[in-house]
Amino acid sequence: PHLRTFTDHFQTCKVQGAWPLIDNNYLNVQVTNTPVLPGSAATATSKLTIIFKNFQECVDQKVYQAEMDELPSAFADGSKNGGDKHGANSLKITEKVSGQHVEIQAKYIGTTIVVRQVGRYLTFAVRMPEEVVNAVEDRDSQGLYLCLRGCPLNQQIDFQAFRANAESPRRPAAASPSPVVPETFPYETAVAKCKEKLPVEDLYYQACVFDLLTTGDVNFTLAAYYALEDGKMLHSNKDKLHLFERTRELPGAVA
Amino acid sequence: CKILKCNSEFWSATSSGSHAPASDDVPEFCAALRTYALCTRRTARTCRGDLAYHSAVHGIEDLMSQHNCSKDGPTSQPRVRTLPPAGDSQERSDSPEICHYEKSFHKHSAAPNYTHCGLFGD
């Protein structure tokens, strides 16, 4: 999936299986990614588990679990708030669109989470105070906290190289993320479809093009569009909303 | 069981929660505590088997001794905020300040810096 980190780095990751997205003193988010096509290195999120840890007189521990075709509007225990403590309403789930869009507000940690199902796969977005982001007991154990550190270098897909291949008349080589490229989606069509929803040619737009070329699934256009929309709602600095390609930096920075 | 109503009335009467009041606020704090104790006694019949009730009772006892409040004395008219209609266990009235990050954050510094992370697509 495409990852926008807390430090505004944008990466395309092939991380497969279960990975920690956020892991701090208050909250743990784990995603499970699966290949979008047989033999493809590109993966998308098929499962998401969020654990809100027990916190003072505010909330009991609550677990939220979403999977493909199952986006619940309640925690795993059936409740929609933080339990039986006095501050239970400082954690609330709101169903925005049944089966498609859920918002979780954790006021006690100033955090808003948006989970969507777009097509077959899930998207995740969060707004969190820096103080909460950095509230970790053991900094050494935080190496693979994706939202904070990004994907390991060996798990990143070279977005720009793929795009260069796609723009050339040849089809991408077998070494590219998706050997099974659907012939039904020429580069021009992908560009046109993405332009419709994402007029600014930023990294969300580039991600959209990449996804259409990789899968041929137009739902990924919506995934990029909603990711940008959620960013508009959740990002505190509107000037930083659109990310653009930078020249290659240090390893682990923007892919 | 209306123990949560007692809790929220106490929290709103002592707007800084159960943190130590300034010395000149102690009589007012003790009055609010006695009101809280009276409220919990009234809920005893319908809350006596629930944890929230026992937590409140023990909490009151602790605060009473911490602040040297006498059991007898004036009670306060709490500055009650409008509460939502009484509901089931999934519905709660006002949360303590500690359960509202922005409110408690503003107590000790400027507005928090927010960050954003997103994951989507393939």
Epitope: D84 | D50, L51, D88, S89
Partner: antibody, heavy 115, light 112 residues
Framework: EVQLVESGGGLVQPGGSLRLSCAAS????????MNWIRQAPGKGLEWIGM????????HYADSVKGRFTISRDNSKNTLYLQMNSLRAEDTAVYYC????????WGQGTMVTVSS | DVVLTQSPLSLPVTLGQPASISCRSS???????????LEWFQQRPGQSPRLLIY???ERFSGVPDRFSGSGSGTDFTLKISRVEAEDVGVYYC?????????FGQGTKLEIK
């Protein structure tokens, strides 16, 4: 959503014993007092007893005192009713209910005491 | 033990019309500090009881506002402002002021 599911009912002979269970979900079970209530066929409701959230106190109706015991296992989110020395008049649907005073009830389990 | 006596035991009502059920206690249900713990339950045919009203007059969550409770001391009333088909069933009053907790014998509401 609060859910209470009773089980363990069935046919038992007078003088026999039976243990009913009530599996709770959708709320923090260990925070609440719990009740057992019964309803004889075609009759009204009768409160049997209640147990505090931490099992520190139990209260019973006179009709079952000494014969019935309420217990709970908070680690399993389960409430129990141990019924001994059963009589024909104990035949009823047995309900568990959440709270010191009952708000949410289970669907009930039928206990028939007959020879 | 506190005895709760309901009347009438059977209540035929026309759809859309109001209905009223009385519950009388053998002793005052008011505690010394003025609190009264009386509840009303509805039991539809073949279903478990459901809490409607607690503390005499407080509607439980999800209960339509056509249901209301009132009373004090020993006399209590449950009112339905406009009876609907789904209101058919047996209604019980219940007291929690004294141990043992007790129910009224029930009032059966049916549609005329």
């Amino acid at each position: 959503e609060v859910q209470l599911v009773e089980s363990g009912g069935g046919l038992v002979q007078p003088g026999g014993s039976l243990r009913l269970s009530c599996a709770a979900s959708g709320f923090t079970f260990s925070n609440y007092g719990m009740n057992w209530i019964r309803q004889a066929p075609g009759k009204g409701l009768e409160w049997i007893g209640m147990i505090y959230y931490d099992s520190s106190e139990k209260h019973y109706a006179d009709s079952v005192k000494g014969r019935f015991t309420i217990s709970r296992d908070n680690s399993k989110n389960t409430l129990y009713l141990q019924m001994n020395s059963l009589r024909a008049e104990d035949t009823a649907v047995y309900y568990c209910a959440k709270g010191t005073t009952p708000d949410y009830w289970g669907q009930g389990t039928m206990v028939t005491v007959s020879s | 033990d506190v005895v709760l006596t309901q009347s009438p035991l059977s209540l035929p009502v026309t759809l859309g019309q109001p209905a009223s059920i009385s519950c009388r206690s053998s002793q005052s249900l008011e505690e010394s500090d003025g609190y009264t713990f009386l509840e009303w339950f509805q039991q539809r045919p073949g279903q478990s009881p459901r809490l409607l009203i607690y503390d005499v007059s407080e509607r439980f969550s999800g209960v339509p506002d056509r249901f209301s409770g009132s009373g004090s001391g020993t006399d209590f009333t449950l009112k339905i402002s406009r009876v609907e088909a789904e209101d058919v069933g047996v209604y019980y009053c219940f007291q929690a002021t004294y141990d043992p907790l007790t129910f009224g014998q029930g009032t059966k509401l049916e549609i005329k």
